[in-house]
Interface confidence: medium
């Protein structure tokens, strides 16, 4: 005669794909201490067990190695451990205790396991700031992964120069030595759970700190089109009395501080403009000479100069003689 017992706890449990869940089971208190038998967990309806401690009974292919009967009759434990949960595991399960020496067995009530889509995503952590030319360790972690599951496979994707560091069951380290051109590019950590065939990823944009690499001056003369100077220029002819607007532009992250100096400044010189714009409303003799734009940045500075050469208006010269 079959004896029935109720599984303690909830009638259903939820687990995310690729993760683990413990189906609690306690052997009935009425079970005699002398009851020697084997335990079997079954998927409702199927007559091949999903887990057992019976050496003569083979379990289902689909659950082999993933479902384990945690058998400890002295502690009345008959719980079922499920790892690498798959969508197909979404079913009702029951436990059966059978003995070859006793006339009766014990069968539990049913418990439903609901397998949901994996919603957790990997975390990417960056210690401090990323500096161009300096190696940094980035960690991709999946702290919600259970230790007994099949270790996930970590993949990194980045245009920046990288090398793989140490990894654990729950994390992978990537050493990155970013370049200025890697700023604002994507870095992706992809985590695959081979036991369940599920892949999750997280993508971040790299924020790379770097000193200015390029500084340029755009020159606006009156109403004429602007032109750009990308390197130090010996002389730029300008007509006396003409309005001139000099616009300095530099890269670098975070943005460099731009300032204008007359002449070739010393480090502690006072700027004539604390922005990237220098307005010269009427060019005269006082403006003849060198103007320097300096791009200052915590990681290094860069400057560019241009030399103004003033052409005097012919009538102006005659009036002065």
């Amino acid at each position: 005669q079959e004896r029935r017992f109720q599984l303690e706890g909830p009638e259903s449990l939820t687990v995310q794909e690729g993760l683990c869940v413990l189906v609690p089971c306690r052997l009935p208190t009425t079970l005699p201490a002398s009851y020697y038998g084997y335990g079997y967990w079954f998927l409702e309806g199927a007559d091949v067990p999903v887990a057992t401690n019976d050496p003569d009974e083979e379990v289902q292919e689909e659950t082999r190695g993933r479902f384990h009967l945690l058998w400890d009759p002295r502690r009345k434990n008959c719980s079922l451990s499920i790892r690498d949960a798959r969508r197909r595991d979404n079913a009702a399960y029951f436990f059966r205790l059978k003995s070859k020496w006793m006339k009766y067995g014990y069968t539990s009530s049913k418990l439903s396991v609901r397998v949901m889509a994996l919603t957790h995503r990997p975390n990417i952590s960056i210690p401090g700031t990323l500096e161009s030319g300096h190696p940094s360790n980035l960690t991709c972690s999946v702290p919600w992964v259970c230790e007994q599951g099949t270790p996930p496979i970590f993949s990194w994707m980045s245009a920046a120069p990288t090398s793989l560091g140490p990894r654990t069951t729950q994390s992978s380290v990537l050493t990155i030595t970013p370049r200025p051109q890697d700023h604002s590019t994507n870095l992706t950590c992809q985590v695959t759970f081979p036991g369940a065939g599920v892949t999750m990823e997280r993508t971040i944009q790299l924020n790379v700190s770097y000193a200015p690499q390029k500084v340029a001056i755009s020159i606006f003369q009156g109403n004429s089109a602007a032109f750009k100077i990308l390197q130090n220029t010996s002389s730029l002819p300008v007509l006396e009395g003409q309005a001139l607007r000099l616009l300095c532009d530099a890269d670098g992250n975070p943005p460099a501080h731009l300032s204008w100096f007359q002449g070739f400044p010393a480090l502690n010189a006072t700027p004539i403009s604390n922005t990237g714009v220098l307005e010269l409303p009427q060019v005269g003799s006082a403006e003849e000479g060198d103007f320097t734009c300096r791009a200052q940045h915590p990681l290094g500075s860069l400057q560019i100069s241009l030399s103004l050469f003033v052409h005097w208006k012919p009538e102006g010269r005659a009036g002065g003689v």
Partner: antibody
Framework: EVQLQQSGPELVKPGASVKMSCKAS????????MHWVKQSHGKSLEWIGN????????SYNQKFKGKATLTVNKSSSTAYMELRSLTSEDSAVYYC??????????????WGQGTTLTVSS | DILLTQSPAILSVSPGERVSFSCRAS??????IHWYQQRTNGSPRLLIK???ESISGIPSRFSGSGSGTDFTLSINSVESEDIADYYC?????????FGGGTKLEIK
């Protein structure tokens, strides 16, 4: 749709052996043991035994030990039963069946169409 | 092994009549009994599981009752398509066993 397709009728001589097949479709073959049942002409049903497709592990009714041998081919989802040292007593219809095994009941929910075995000289 | 005795061996009824099949177990088996119908040259078909639980796709005129050692399958209004052999099966103890069957005939 679950289907169990059995091989055709067999006419064999006494003392010979015969091997019949049962091809399963419409479900995961390894989730269910394949059971075999004998029905002699005009008589009732007798459970012969079952086989676990995962490892070929078998369980036999004592009466059929030494008479029947159950095997499977997992890749083709096919179960086989070989009967040896045949006598006229073995003339019968043999069914393969899938057992629903639940927490509150177990019963044969799907049956093959049967293979008729005639043992005659 | 548990012995299942079905009676009578043959039942003869007129269409529309109510009919009952009996199945007796040699020892108490709770409600672990199942009923099958087998038409001529056909395979057994599950009618009732666990003594009284209905099966989807089976006409509602079929019902089951009983527990312990005595079980009954009833057809409340017999139709001509019900001509068949009826078997009970126990799943309480290994090995599973079947009753000897009852043949239903139409007068």
């Amino acid at each position: 749709e679950v289907q169990l397709q059995q091989s055709g009728p067999e006419l064999v001589k006494p003392g010979a052996s015969v091997k019949m097949s049962c091809k399963a479709s419409g479900y995961t073959f390894t989730d269910y043991k394949m059971h075999w049942v004998k029905q002699s002409h005009g008589k009732s049903l007798e459970w012969i035994g079952n086989i676990n497709p995962n490892n070929g592990g078998t369980s036999y009714n004592q009466k059929f030990k030494g008479k029947a041998t159950l095997t499977v081919n997992k890749s083709s989802s096919t179960a086989y039963m070989e009967l040896r040292s045949l006598t006229s007593e073995d003339s019968a219809v043999y069914y393969c069946a899938r057992r629903y095994y639940g927490s509150s009941s177990s019963y044969f929910d799907y049956w093959g169409q049967g293979t008729t075995l005639t043992v005659s000289s | 092994d548990i012995l299942l005795t079905q009676s009578p061996a043959i039942l003869s009824v007129s269409p529309g009549e109510r009919v009952s099949f009996s199945c007796r177990a040699s020892q108490s088996i709770g409600t672990s009994i199942h009923w099958y119908q087998q038409r001529t040259n056909g395979s057994p078909r599950l009618l009732i599981k666990y003594a009284s639980e209905s099966i989807s796709g089976i006409p509602s005129r079929f019902s089951g009752s009983g527990s312990g050692t005595d079980f009954t399958l009833s057809i409340n209004s017999v139709e001509s398509e019900d001509i068949a052999d009826y078997y009970c099966q126990q799943s309480n103890s290994w090995p599973t066993t079947f009753g000897g069957g009852t043949k239903l005939e139409i007068k």
